[in-house]
Interface confidence: low
């Protein structure tokens, strides 16, 4: 009974009552400096210790700033909208000081016919209508403005981008006699763009366009497009760069072939292929030209459309990531997995340790998870001794001001982590293993037991007795 | 016709010891999880214990850990819920509950065994 | 843990109308699509009956005249033609985490 995992998360607090926006103070500095963690990496509790005190000491002075909360805006522009035709929109917190956005994607699986998308209505109507969409969020993870939740880009213009388009952020279809429902995801992200340019993302260095899930695959779709729209309308300055949350998916054989019934248990190349035609969906153009009119689903999948993409992008993906088992029809329900399972889920990871071979900026650890950057304890897992926000600081500092990345890494400053260990949880810094169905918690000697590892031929390898590597897993989880 | 048939509640002293049972039929034991669920007189509904298919993983709630052992046996079809060190507070009407293979909710209940700890 | 918080403690309805009880929970029950989130009725001297499951599925057997919806960290239970039978307490449930706590119940009755 494994496989989905919980993290811990912040209460949620209800919205402030509505305030005036503090005018900014005059002789603010027009950019926040980098963090370099190189100097501290041994000491990070009492960095951090000094790093919050600071913050404090000054709270008095920028109130505003330390508030959590990002405010709903609806596009100005109504005509782009979500799937049932009520307004697009992005939540924004601004930090003044700083020339750095972000601009996150949200996920949600998609929909591909009228069939699946009325019962996403019926049941998921948030990812399709902005009609009961909160007044404000609060920004968790990479999205946080807190140092130690987000030692990485805490003071960043903060842009989080609701999904309500069931689209993968790819269409371009509005709302007609003809369609019951609008399909504009690609729209959406060039109509906040527009938006945000008014609202100080003129003046930006760098956008990082973000995402996870379904927001993470929006990325790769998008990021380009992006970066071509800013050239357009007379930005060619701002740096645009891609972070592909649990987006990159395989177009792999499923464990169980089904037929192609809902959103779920259709393979994921034929729901994407009914998808595109659904959609009216668009592709990088660089990706579009290198395969045949038809098929241009393939740009869906992030090993066959990174190589085409110009922007860099940093790709984060669990080896084993649970999206991609549940397209490929593995259900881990409680009862103990067969070797056939246990084989078809380390090839999994195998296939996928494959893909990002020749990514150079990726954090893959050997995990059974889902989404990382905007969990509070993003900062929790670490590949070879390198956490995700440091990975991420690393990759700034790799790409200097230019707009590629360098090929030579920094010493003492990975950007390329990839877990090499062949089984899900081999990471001791994975994420707390939870029952998939109950959310209750397993140790991951319990967990791997129950995967059907034999503890032996798991200690071997690593030249362990089976109870020394019980005794390690245990201590490390 | 699936069933789960609760005994061995009665009349405790404080400090003293009962062992619940639970017979199953109609279904094959072995492949649920089983969760016991206690409701104190007029009040509402509080998890006690949960099982695994197995036995291979086993969960207490704050208030009884320490004192009370879920077991089962499968070849008997049997859940059991040893109870020591028993408490005024650990009055209640004690329902075994099976939890659905796929969302950890109770599809099947017992009908409940009364406990009563009292002097 | 997770704190469930029922409300309305209990609600009188007139039969044939509608009665609607909300279950709010102290941090979002619902990941990857699924919302672990169960309804109960119990009634006197009986053990509690599964009504509804994850959010939103009637378990067989129930009257379709029930309901459930919400995600996150909002449900609904909604019973849109209210009959005598249906006089009991009712619970809310999550599943996503140990441990899987209730609603403190709501009671129905009848106006």
């Known amino acids: 009974s494994e496989g989905r995992k919980t993290w811990r998360r912040r209460g949620q607090q209800p919205p402030p009552p509505p305030r005036t926006e503090a005018a900014p103070a005059a002789g603010q500095p027009v950019e926040s400096f980098p963090l370099d963690f190189t100097a501290v990496e041994g000491n990070m509790d009492s960095f951090m210790a000094q790093v919050k005190s600071l913050a404090q000491s000054l709270y008095p002075c920028s109130a505003q700033q330390l508030n959590e909360d990002l405010r709903l805006h609806l596009l100005l522009n109504t005509s782009v909208t979500c799937n049932d035709g009520s307004p697009a929109g992005y939540y924004l917190k601004e930090s003044r000081g700083s020339r750095r956005w972000l601009l996150f994607l949200e996920g949600g699986w998609y929909c591909f016919n009228r069939e699946n998308c009325d019962s996403r209505y019926d049941t998921m109507r948030r990812l399709m209508s902005s009609r009961d969409w909160p007044r404000t969020r609060t920004g968790t993870g990479i999205l946080s403005s807190q140092p130690e939740e987000n030692p990485y880009w805490w003071n960043a213009n903060m842009v989080f981008i609701p999904y309500c388009s069931s689209d993968v952020w790819s269409g371009a279809s509005s709302k007609s006699e003809k369609n019951e429902y609008a399909f504009m995801g690609a729209l959406i992200i060039q109509e906040v763009v527009r938006e945000l340019l008014g609202r100080g993302l003129s003046g930006a260095k760098v956008l990082l366009l973000a995402g996870s899930s379904a927001g993470g695959t929006g990325v790769l779709l998008n990021v380009d497009r992006v970066a071509e729209q800013l050239e357009k309308l007379g930005y060619p300055a701002i740096q645009v760069r891609g972070l592909a949350d649990s987006g990159w998916f395989l177009d792999n054989k499923q464990y169980r072939h089904t037929d192609c019934v809902d959103t779920i248990t259709c393979a994921p190349t034929e729901a994407i292929r009914r998808g595109i035609r659904y959609w009216n969906g668009v592709v990088p153009e660089r990706c579009r030209r290198q395969f045949q009119e038809g098929e241009e689903w393939n740009c869906f999948f992030g090993y066959k459309v990174y190589p085409t993409l110009r922007c860099p992008v940093f790709v984060v993906q669990w080896l084993f990531d649970e999206a991609q088992l549940t397209v490929d029809n593995v259900h881990l329900t409680g009862q103990p997995v067969q070797e056939g399972l246990r084989l078809y889920i380390q090839n999994l990871g195998r296939e996928l340790r494959h893909t990002l071979k020749d990514v150079p900026a990726s954090f893959a650890p050997a995990c059974l998870s889902h989404e990382i950057i905007i969990r509070s304890h993003w900062t929790d897992v670490q590949v070879k001794g390198t956490s995700l926000p440091r990975a991420l600081h690393c990759w700034d500092r790799s790409l200097h001001d230019s707009h590629k990345a360098s090929k030579t890494p920094l010493k003492g400053c990975p950007v390329h982590l990839v877990d090499s260990c062949p089984w899900p949880h081999c990471n001791p810094s994975c994420p707390t293993v939870r029952d998939q169905f109950t959310g209750q918690e397993m140790n991951v000697a319990q967990f791997l037991m129950h995967m059907g590892f034999d503890m032996q031929t798991v200690a071997q390898p690593q030249g362990l007795e089976p109870s020394e590597l019980l005794g390690m897993l245990s201590n490390g989880s | 016709e699936v069933q789960l048939v609760e005994s061995g509640g009665g009349l405790v002293q404080p400090g003293g010891s009962l062992r619940l049972s639970c017979a199953a039929s109609g279904f094959t034991f072995s492949d649920y999880g089983m969760h016991w669920v206690r409701q104190a007189p007029g009040k509402g509904l509080e998890w006690v214990s949960y099982i695994s298919s197995g036995s291979r993983t086993v969960y207490y709630a704050d208030s009884v850990k320490g004192r009370f052992t879920i077991s089962r046996d499968n070849a008997k079809n049997s859940l059991y819920l040893q109870m020591n060190s028993l408490r005024d507070e650990d009055t209640a009407v004690y329902y075994c509950?099976?939890?659905?293979?796929?969302?950890?909710?109770?599809?099947?209940w017992g009908q409940g065994t009364l406990v009563t700890v009292s002097s | 843990d997770i704190v469930m918080t029922q409300s309305p403690d209990s609600l009188a309805v007139s039969l044939g109308e509608r009665a609607t009880i909300n279950c709010r929970a102290s941090k979002i029950v619902s990941t990857s699509g699924y919302s672990y989130m169960h309804w109960y009725q119990q009634k006197p001297g009986q053990p509690p009956k599964l009504l509804i499951y994850?959010?939103?599925n009637l378990e067989s057997g129930v009257p379709d005249r029930f309901s459930g919806s919400g995600s996150g960290t909002d449900f609904t239970l909604t019973i849109s033609s209210l009959q005598a039978e249906d006089v009991a307490v009712y619970y809310c449930?999550?599943?996503?985490?140990?441990?899987?706590?209730f609603g403190q119940g709501t009671k129905l009755e009848i106006k």
């Open positions: 994850l959010a939103s």
């Open positions: 509950a099976r939890k659905h293979y796929n969302g950890g909710y109770f599809d099947v």
């Open positions: 449930q999550h599943s996503r985490e140990l441990p899987p706590t």
